[in-house]
């Protein structure tokens, strides 16, 4: 039979400038001598010769004189190749071809890597900064390989993904310099961290900058809302929290509070000229009048509907003003699925049946999963449709076409992705012939 040549399955990772060993081995037969051995290392893609051993002799390196075999180990079946002073250009697949009585070959991958330097951070503009100013923060890290992954986050560890531009340029050696630019609107103060990750080495290089802007000439009102969406069930009441810090001596006569829909700017509720101007939103909103003086500008939204979903802006004006937007995520649980079978009688193994799983009046759209009695997912031949009713709630119908075995259980799981609520239904089909549902 053909000769079995063994190489590592995983790529060999080598740092730029270091030496790497590309392992390759074969099993010599009894009585094997090096005179019989023909060993060729080449680049897999281009077939360029790298190194060879033939006619009982090392034929030397054909690859910039940077390769060597392990001559003392060849007779034991060790055909490994030593590659010195690894460069980025060496990355790729190398084929180890061994020929004795028969022949065989295998390819080993070389993955080159270089760690990234600790990032340096620059700020533009870098003086006279005020809350509300837009600044450009540049994070630069050098001489890494392969291309980096760059992550930005704020002082609370929350990822910052918007307004990031990252560029990576390779130098003559093929090493990358990475420059990532974050454009951010300053708050009262903030820490911005940049993490440059080498995906091969799983090496992270971090830097951060803390910006404490000057107090603006007339300090804007800082309005606080929850970062995460407020989740409310259809038909229940929801509180959209919003708060500000009243100055000493603050009176409600100074307060102007406006709630509106962020996108359309439609007025929802307002408090101006020292009094609650009431709901402009189907009379389903209310403030917390007893708490306003303490800086609680929250809005109560009654009998939540699907159409309420979206972003609401809380705008507070006193001596100065500020605003923040809070998201309302509406949800409704799905009903326990009902299961139907077609055909539903005289079923035999080998028959194709259609199993329908129906679940009603949920929101938002469901995720539907099918599995067999062993918990193995069933993904082929599934058709799922979701229809919204007048209230915007979805009825979901998922159809599985399956060929019956001797017996089997088929489960349908309807998941509400917001509530992380799972509604299950299952049907077990046994015996033959059989009828569904079973007759009493």
């Amino acid at each position: 039979g053909a000769l079995e040549v063994q190489v590592p399955e995983d790529p060999v990772v080598a740092l730029v400038g270091t030496d790497a060993t590309l392992c390759c081995s074969f099993s010599p037969e009894p009585g094997f001598s090096l005179a019989q051995l023909n060993l060729i290392w080449q680049l897999t893609d281009t077939k360029q010769l790298v190194h060879s051993f033939a006619e009982g002799q090392d034929q030397g390196s054909a690859y910039a004189n940077r390769t060597a075999l392990f001559p003392d180990l060849l007779a034991q079946g060790n055909a490994s190749l030593r590659l010195q002073r690894v460069r980025v250009a060496d990355e790729g697949s190398f084929t180890c071809f061994v020929s004795i009585r028969d022949f065989g070959s295998a390819a080993v991958s070389l993955q080159v890597a270089a760690p990234y330097s600790k990032p340096s951070m620059t700020l533009e503009p870098n003086k006279d900064l005020r809350p509300g100013d837009t600044v450009t923060i540049t994070c630069s890290s050098y001489q890494g390989y392969p291309e980096a992954e760059v992550f930005w986050q704020d002082g609370q560890g929350v990822p910052l993904t918007g307004n990031v531009t990252t560029s990576q340029m390779a130098n003559e050696q093929g090493l990358f310099d990475v420059h990532s630019i974050l454009r951010v609107v300053l708050g009262a103060n903030g820490t911005y961290s940049c993490l440059v990750r080498n995906p091969v080495l799983q090496q992270d290089a971090h830097s951060s900058v803390t910006i404490t802007p000057q107090r603006s000439p007339t300090g804007a009102v800082e309005v606080q809302v929850p970062e995460d969406p407020v989740v409310a069930l259809v038909g229940t009441d929801a509180t959209l929290r919003c708060s500000f810090s009243p100055e000493p001596g603050f009176s409600l006569a100074q307060l102007n509070l406006i709630w509106q829909l962020t996108d359309t700017k439609q007025l929802v509720h307002s408090f101006t000229e020292g009094r609650d101007q009431g709901s402009a939103y189907a009379n389903r909103t209310a403030l917390f009048p007893d708490l306003l003086a303490q800086g609680n500008a929250s809005l109560r939204l009654q009998r939540v509907r699907v159409a309420d979903e979206g972003s609401f802006t809380c705008f507070v004006s006193i001596r100065d003003f500020g605003s923040a937007a809070v998201s309302l995520q509406v949800a409704a649980p799905y009903s326990k699925p009902s299961m139907t079978l077609e055909p539903n009688k005289d079923l035999r193994p080998g028959d194709t049946v259609t199993i329908t799983c129906s679940s009603y009046r949920g929101y938002p759209e469901a995720e539907v999963f099918w599995q067999d009695g062993q918990g193995v997912p069933l993904t082929g031949n599934v058709t799922t449709s979701q229809m919204a009713n007048e209230q915007g709630l979805f009825d979901v119908h998922s159809v599985l076409r399956v060929v019956l075995g001797a017996n089997g259980t088929y489960s349908c799981l309807v998941r509400n992705p917001v509530l992380q609520q799972d509604a299950h239904g299952s049907v077990t089909i046994t015996g033959q012939p059989m009828t569904f549902p079973p007759e009493a």
Epitope: D133, Q254, E273, T313, F315, R319, F321, G322
Partner: antibody, heavy 119, light 109 residues
Framework: QVQLQQSGAEVKKPGSSVKVSCKAS????????ISWVRQAPGQGLEWMGG????????NYAQKFQGRVTITADESTSTAYMELSSLRSEDTAVYYC????????????WGQGTMVTVSS | EIVLTQSPATLSLSPGERATLSCRAS??????LAWYQQKPGQAPRLLIY???NRATGIPARFSGSGSGTDFTLTISSLEPEDFAVYYC???????????FGQGTKLEIK
């Protein structure tokens, strides 16, 4: 730092309209309060109206009510002031001004746009 | 509509002297009052906001005082670059609207 850049000088006929633009850079435009102030030659400052883009609410001085329209385009960070039914007394330098994010005091001003109304 | 009356209309003083400019409102404006300086051919410059707070970069010789209906801008020792026109301005609570006084011209004697 916030900057306001206004459109160029205009010469208009009586009875026509003029629309002056004011582009903001270096901050969060939607959270500004933008005011429009004019100054006739040798005269004092006159507040015409203003807008807070995040609210989309504009309000106007009584004197200009019905003749001035102030709008804001958040996508381009630009505010506009349109004055209609122009007369010779409307010849003036028109300024946009803001306090930047969340501030009412007008500490940032555009360079001014000269509007001349002449037949 | 609130009317702001500034006095005097013109004030003639010499460098080094103290200047006191007055602004009176026809009804209470709380403390939402600002002072601006304007030189020929230039946009106005904010000096004082909320009656008594100096804006960024404004020298300490400028100070504001007052509340309700009577307000004062004081320049403790006039510098040559201080000769200009000064305007007071009030802001109504809601919706935010502004009124300027007619101005006081501060000229070199």
């Amino acid at each position: 730092q916030v900057q306001l850049q206004q459109s160029g000088a205009e010469v208009k006929k009586p009875g026509s309209s003029v629309k002056v633009s004011c582009k903001a850079s270096g901050g969060t435009f939607s959270s500004y309060a933008i005011s429009w102030v004019r100054q006739a030659p040798g005269q004092g400052l006159e507040w015409m109206g203003g807008i807070i883009p995040i609210l989309g609410i504009a309000n106007y001085a009584q004197k200009f009510q019905g003749r001035v329209t102030i709008t804001a385009d958040e996508s381009t960070s630009t505010a506009y002031m349109e004055l209609s039914s122009l007369r010779s007394e409307d010849t003036a330098v028109y300024y946009c001004a803001t306090g930047g994010s969340g501030r009412y005091a007008l500490d940032i001003w555009g360079q001014g746009t000269m509007v001349t109304v002449s037949s | 509509e609130i009317v702001l009356t500034q006095s005097p209309a013109t004030l003639s003083l010499s460098p080094g002297e103290r200047a006191t400019l007055s602004c009176r409102a026809s009804q209470s404006v709380s403390s939402y009052l600002a002072w601006y300086q304007q030189k020929p051919g230039q946009a106005p410059r904010l000096l004082i906001y909320d009656a008594s707070n100096r804006a960024t970069g404004i020298p300490a010789r400028f100070s504001g005082s007052g509340s309700g209906t009577d307000f004062t801008l004081t320049i403790s020792s006039l510098e040559p670059e201080d000769f200009a026109v000064y305007y007071c301005q009030q802001r109504s609570n809601w919706p935010p609207s502004y009124t300027f006084g007619q101005g006081t011209k501060l000229e070199i004697k």
